[in-house]
């Protein structure tokens, strides 16, 4: 039987307002509204929390019965839809201990886990997975790309008691591995031996000057020489102009700096590699994954352009149940959502084309009027008369 610690689908109208608490840490936090957005698969089922004000910080949270994930799997899952074509904004959640003062939640409030998509400019389109370990927020060392389109996507984080993890987007695995390998929770297992240093006679030069090579005797020639073809101008006046000196030209026999040829260094030992030793500071921690207490799920975000919808929150200990729940929510409405969006786009295209046609028609009409105004007034004649006139004139 799966343990479901938290589940929120916003299916009871305004009921969510009694379960979710707005932070009062700042007076100008943005407002969340319940909405299924401009397009959806199912207007009721797809209702979620939507950010509604541009260029705002948001801070909203919901509490649940506190639990510990010690000795069991933790699954955090939710859907995010950036229908506003997001430029810079968060789509992640934070899991807090139940000691959090929800009315004072803010960016520096200590959390256990932060997970979800984040987009900001061209440089950031990633899924954050951050664990607070021994009081410090530790970022994943891998780059997990998030979805940056306008549709709803399902994000899932699985943390297992064997210290492994998995990240899924739309119920497909996008990353997995071990917590110890992919985060810097622990000091490195090996370090450079502080007592080792490169021996003084260690020769890292692959090539050396050939000691038998010597500079040819005729090598040294000046770089510039007086131009032998230059002639003193006839009107040159030594008294007025001083002593005439021919201009200088590049010496064709100049060979530059002589360098002895290079030969393989018989004493070459290769690049010295600093030997490593076991790091005395390192000791494994089998309980990296474990937290004593989860009690609050929070949305602590910044959004330049608002419109993101969060829905289908789930915290459980059962991977299969989470996958099933994802398929029954996001999985069921995603196709219809795309259909509605495509239909809207098509209608918009048609409207645009109609508007363009109307504009063109108006422009043609205006041009015709302008031409009439500009041309000199002629007595009106019937078409027949005009044509005959044309024939006879021709």
């Amino acid at each position: 039987e799966p343990a479901v610690y938290f589940k929120e689908q916003f299916l009871d109208g305004d009921g969510w307002t009694s379960r979710w608490i707005e932070s009062k840490h700042k007076s100008d936090f943005g407002k969340f509204v319940l909405s299924s957005g401009k397009f959806y698969g199912d207007e009721e089922k797809d209702k979620g929390l939507q950010t509604s004000q541009d260029a705002r910080f948001y801070a909203l949270s919901a509490s649940f019965e506190p639990f510990s994930n010690k000795g069991q799997t933790l699954v955090v899952q939710f859907t995010v839809k950036h229908e506003q074509n997001i430029d810079c904004g968060g789509g992640y959640v934070k899991l807090f201990p139940n000691s959090l003062d929800q009315t004072d939640m803010h960016g520096d409030s200590e959390y256990n886990i932060m997970f979800g998509p984040d987009i900001c400019g061209p440089g950031t389109k990633k899924v954050h997975v951050i664990f607070n370990y021994k009081g410090k927020n530790v970022l994943i060392n891998k780059d997990i790309r998030c979805k940056d389109d306008e549709f709803t996507h399902l994000y899932t984080l699985i943390v297992r008691p064997d210290n492994t993890y998995e990240v899924k987007i739309d119920n497909s695995q996008v990353e997995s591995g071990s917590l110890e390998d992919d985060w810097d929770f622990l000091p490195p297992k090996k370090i450079k031996d502080p007592d080792a240093s490169k021996p003084e006679d260690w020769d890292e030069r692959a090539k050396i000057d050939d000691p038998t090579d010597s500079k040819p005797e005729d090598w040294d020639k000046p770089e510039h020489i007086p131009d032998p073809d230059a002639k003193k101008p006839e009107d040159w006046d030594e008294e007025m102009d001083g002593e005439w000196e021919p201009p200088v030209i590049q010496n064709p026999e100049y060979k530059g700096e002589w360098k002895p040829r290079q030969i393989d260094n018989p004493d070459y030992k290769g690049t010295w590699i600093h030997p490593e030793i076991d790091n005395p500071e390192y000791s494994p921690d089998p309980s990296i994954y474990a937290y004593d207490n989860f009690g609050v799920l929070g949305l602590d975000l910044w959004q330049v352009k608002s419109g993101t919808i969060f829905d289908n929150f789930l915290i459980t200990n059962d991977e299969a149940y989470a996958e099933e729940f994802g398929n029954e929510t996001w999985g069921v409405t995603k196709a219809a959502e795309k259909q509605m969006k495509d239909k809207q786009d098509e209608e918009q295209r048609t409207r645009r084309m109609m508007r363009t046609k109307m504009r063109m028609r108006r422009m043609r009409r205006t041009r015709r009027k302008m031409r009439r105004k500009m041309s000199p007034a002629r007595p009106r004649t019937s078409c027949r008369e005009a044509c005959l006139q044309g024939w006879t004139e021709a």
Epitope: G90, C120, G121, P122, T124, N137, L139, D184, L301
Partner: antibody, heavy 127, light 107 residues
Framework: QMQLVQSGAEVKKPGSSVKVSCKAS????????ISWVRQAPGQGLEWMGG????????NYAQKFQGRVTITADESTSTAYMELSSLRSEDTAVYYC????????????????????WGQGTTVTVSS | SYVLTQPPSVSVAPGKTARITCGGN??????VHWYQQKPGQSPVLVIY???KRPSGIPERFSGSNSGNTATLTISGTQAMDEADYYC?????????FGGGTKLTVLG
């Protein structure tokens, strides 16, 4: 890679103000936090404040609160630091430095350090 | 306000390992960055997030951080490593720098 070019040296009288500019190129200006750090002759580095252009909000070190104003003009990719009520102790080299945001939250930049620095602007305050 | 304490100077023989410490209350819970500054030049980031090296920084630079002390280690120190080194953290919405350590490479 982002590059930061600062305005030239300034000589100012006590009580006056100075405004130093820092122009960014080769990167997306809005994807960085810009900090201002100063260094008095023979002394260490001292953080004065910073701004995240995309958020438009600046924050300042307590010591400089009320005396420093940091602004950014996204259209010209330029950050500015204005220090008022100058005194001789403000004689220093003033640096701008950038930190990549790598996220939409105001706190992201502090994970990554100040990875690009301007060449520094010497401000001399003397009567 | 948060205070970071560094030794004013550290000396090391060429090829040996230099260690520069940065002390702060519970510094192990913070992300520590290290900067190198040579005379007349702007600072350069050599370590971020306790022990990550930006591209272009030699492998001989490494960092660690736990408890109340963060450490910058330079193994196989070279003459070109002679410089001032500063640690830095973010605390309560403020960037805090240590007082700096002058590293002298002997000989």
């Amino acid at each position: 890679q982002m590059q930061l070019v600062q305005s030239g040296a300034e000589v100012k009288k006590p009580g006056s103000s100075v405004k130093v500019s820092c122009k960014a190129s080769g990167g997306t200006f809005s994807s960085y936090a810009i900090s201002w750090v100063r260094q008095a002759p023979g002394q260490g580095l001292e953080w004065m404040g910073g701004i995240i252009p995309i958020f438009g909000t600046a924050n300042y070190a307590q010591k400089f609160q009320g005396r420093v104003t940091i602004t950014a003009d996204e259209s010209t990719s330029t950050a500015y630091m204005e220090l008022s009520s100058l005194r001789s102790e403000d004689t220093a080299v003033y640096y701008c430095a950038s930190s990549p945001l790598r996220g939409s939250g105001w706190y992201w930049h502090y994970y990554y350090g100040m990875d690009v620095w301007g060449q520094g602007t010497t401000v001399t305050v003397s009567s | 306000s948060y205070v970071l304490t560094q030794p004013p100077s550290v000396s090391v023989a060429p090829g040996k390992t230099a260690r520069i410490t940065c002390g702060g209350n519970n510094i192990g819970t913070k992300s520590v960055h290290w900067y190198q500054q040579k005379p007349g030049q702007s600072p350069v980031l050599v370590i971020y997030q306790d022990r990550k090296r930006p591209s272009g920084i030699p492998e001989r630079f490494s960092g660690s951080n736990s408890g109340n002390t963060a450490t910058l280690t330079i193994s196989g120190t070279q003459a070109m490593d002679e410089a001032d080194y500063y640690c830095q953290v973010w605390d309560s919405s403020t960037e805090v720098f240590g007082g700096g350590t002058k590293l002298t490479v002997l000989g």
